[in-house]
Interface confidence: low
Amino acid sequence: PASLAGCYSAPRRAPLWTCLLLCAALRTLLASPSNEVNLLDSRTVMGDLGWIAFPKNGWEEIGEVDENYAPIHTYQVCKVMEQNQNNWLLTSWISNEGASRIFIELKFTLRDCNSLPGGLGTCKETFNMYYFESDDQNGRNIKENQYIKIDTIAADESFTELDLGDRVMKLNTEVRDVGPLSKKGFYLAFQDVGACIALVSVRVYYKKCPSVVRHLAVFPDTITGADSSQLLEVSGSCVNHSVTDEPPKMHCSAEGEWLVPIGKCMCKAGYEEKNGTCQVCRPGFFKASPHIQSCGKCPPHSYTHEEASTSCVCEKDYFRRESDPPTMACTRPPSAPRNAISNVNETSVFLEWIPPADTGGRKDVSYYIACKKCNSHAGVCEECGGHVRYLPRQSGLKNTSVMMVDLLAHTNYTFEIEAVNGVSDLSPGARQYVSVNVTTNQAAPSPVTNVKKGKIAKNSISLSWQEPDRPNGIILEYEIKYFEKDQETSYTIIKSKETTITAEGLKPASVYVFQIRARTAAGYGVFSRRFEFETTPVFAASSDQSQIP
């Protein structure tokens, strides 16, 4: 086969139909889409294209200029009357810039063979396109059979002489793709076998997924894969002031479209998304977490003077627990409970109240009962101690009532009902409580425990004792029961308002059993244990006043 190297066809004046064709064609040439990167666009080359034709009388370049006097590179061939045409047009070396799949867009016109007189046997309406890969920019001295055919190109629209007269140019656009490419560049070749063609423009490009910011992640320009069905996974990087739980990824399709986003970036705490960037929260606003969409106004009773705040500072006298979410208003301790009332039943007290007028802005209000036992004479109060029972409990009360049992009878108590909430322990302020003063009812007194013998004679015994430990009211009187030992059914009762008595009319040298009990308005207490004392014989002197064991 003949070599295609070293051949060059000098430009000649083009026939009228080509010029008409160009004028129409130029108006249709549009800018390339953003996902296409041109490797060659014959329309934009200002100087010599450097293409070669073989044989020299085959393809010829038509030198035209556009309205800005920029050259227009058009190649034509129209050897329709001659047989066995084999006209080649070779491009210069085209770098593939790392792309493994490229696209060739041809814009051309083709004469309808039926409109050409006498050439029906030799006229063709197709041409062929080939390519040859090479790392060598000066490697055009190759044989025809080394080129790989891309496709036979046919026109969708051919034109006739009539069209020329009407100046209606039928420009064809055909796109073919080639891949996978493995070398740094390639040559294209166009083979005419006897058609009437004007090759108006050749654009060689690859497709990329253009750099994009999606979900606050930047994805770089990405050249599409070699396979038309291939999806390339591309990692994105988060924009300034953003973070991610799951690294952002997208897939670049063979058509240069971004598909199937995975993961996303979020503006970090203190920043919010605006126009695809992360902007600081302005003073008075905050964002506590990347998972929150936008900055929020500081909640009630809090503020921030800073940009990029992740939380707001509570105003004076307002607080926030560590467990309170930052979106929650700052709160304060509650005011005191109100309208406390008491109901006394012997040694039990039932307290009831209504909630504080100001809960401090919280729902976790509970109540604590402080119990103080007060001495009305000394004006002193002391803690009640552990014997008092609280129903249901003393602290953490949710209901507005409580029952205290096992109180001392006939005793002055002060109960402080304190309202507390989740921030009470954070506040240095005074406790908020309402006081209720109550006096428990009188009850039967406890037993007399401490009895001393006084003067003992042959016919009488004098005794003294202390008031019961728990008088449970005002002692009205004491009842003293005594009998001669082993004569229990024959007893005597003496009543006394004092804590001393003398039992008279007793037998000398006899043992007597004494029991004492006290009475209040609530009734008698139980008798004391038995105390035994012996009258003296007729001859003995009085005994001392020693303590009974």
């Epitope: 003077h305 500072v313 004076k316 006298d317 560590e322 240095p428 302020g429």
Partner: antibody
């Protein structure tokens, strides 16, 4: 009753380090923020550092930031002040204080002298 | 950073009233605490949160706070009130406790 007892003071050369401790008792230590306050001889009170009850937040005066570290061990009811790169102007009595009611309990202080 | 200004000294006759001022920008928006310190002793809180008294502090000690000035008032001054006094606030913009300079109260 509430008691705060500082220890760890003494004489140290410029550039040296000391660690002060403050043992607390008589109150729920982990519920309250704590501070270190110092007083140079014949001078007024100067706040040094503070720490929240949980230990999660710490605060420092500009004069000690980067040199002193406040910490606490709530299991031991103890507050610490690690002092590095000491200077002559750090000479003072160092007090620890609670903030139960804005600093209403103070220790008796421990003297730190920085001198060559 | 936030600054508190106190007079260096205040003199008062026994039984009279002593007033110690503490000046600071918009101090009324802050909680002011007052400390008393006697020679060789640790400071003692005498007023907190502008005007509250801890238990055990006599009613003669009172506080107020308005505008740009907080005031500690000691009425019916006694010889035992002779001491250094300090005001203190928490400055939330710098996250610092701030003490005023000391005021020496002398009972004549």
């Amino acid at each position: 009753q509430v008691q705060l007892v500082e220890s760890g003071g003494g004489l140290v050369q410029p550039g040296g380090s000391l660690r002060l401790s403050c043992a607390a008792s008589g109150f729920t230590f982990s519920s309250y923020a704590m501070s270190w306050v110092r007083q140079a001889p014949g001078k007024g009170l100067e706040w040094v550092s503070a720490i929240s009850g949980s230990g999660g937040s710490t605060y420092y005066a500009d004069s000690v930031k980067g040199r002193f570290t406040i910490s606490r061990d709530n299991s031991k009811n103890t507050l610490y002040l690690q002092m590095n790169s000491l200077r002559a102007e750090d000479t003072a009595v160092y007090y620890c204080a609670t903030h139960a009611a804005a600093g209403d309990y103070w220790g008796q202080g421990t003297l730190v002298t920085v001198s060559s | 950073s936030y600054e508190l200004i106190q007079p260096p000294s205040v003199s008062v006759a026994p039984g009279q009233t002593a007033r110690i001022t503490c000046g600071g920008s918009n101090i009324r928006s802050k909680s002011v605490h007052w400390y008393q310190q006697k020679p060789g002793q640790a400071p003692v809180l005498v007023v907190y949160d502008d005007s509250d008294r801890p238990s055990g502090i006599p009613e003669r000690f009172s506080g107020s706070n308005s505008g740009n000035t907080a005031t500690l008032t000691i009425s019916r001054v006694e010889a035992g009130d002779e001491a250094d006094y300090y005001c203190q606030v928490w400055d939330s913009s710098s996250d610092h406790w701030v003490f005023g300079g000391r005021t020496k109260v002398t009972v004549l």
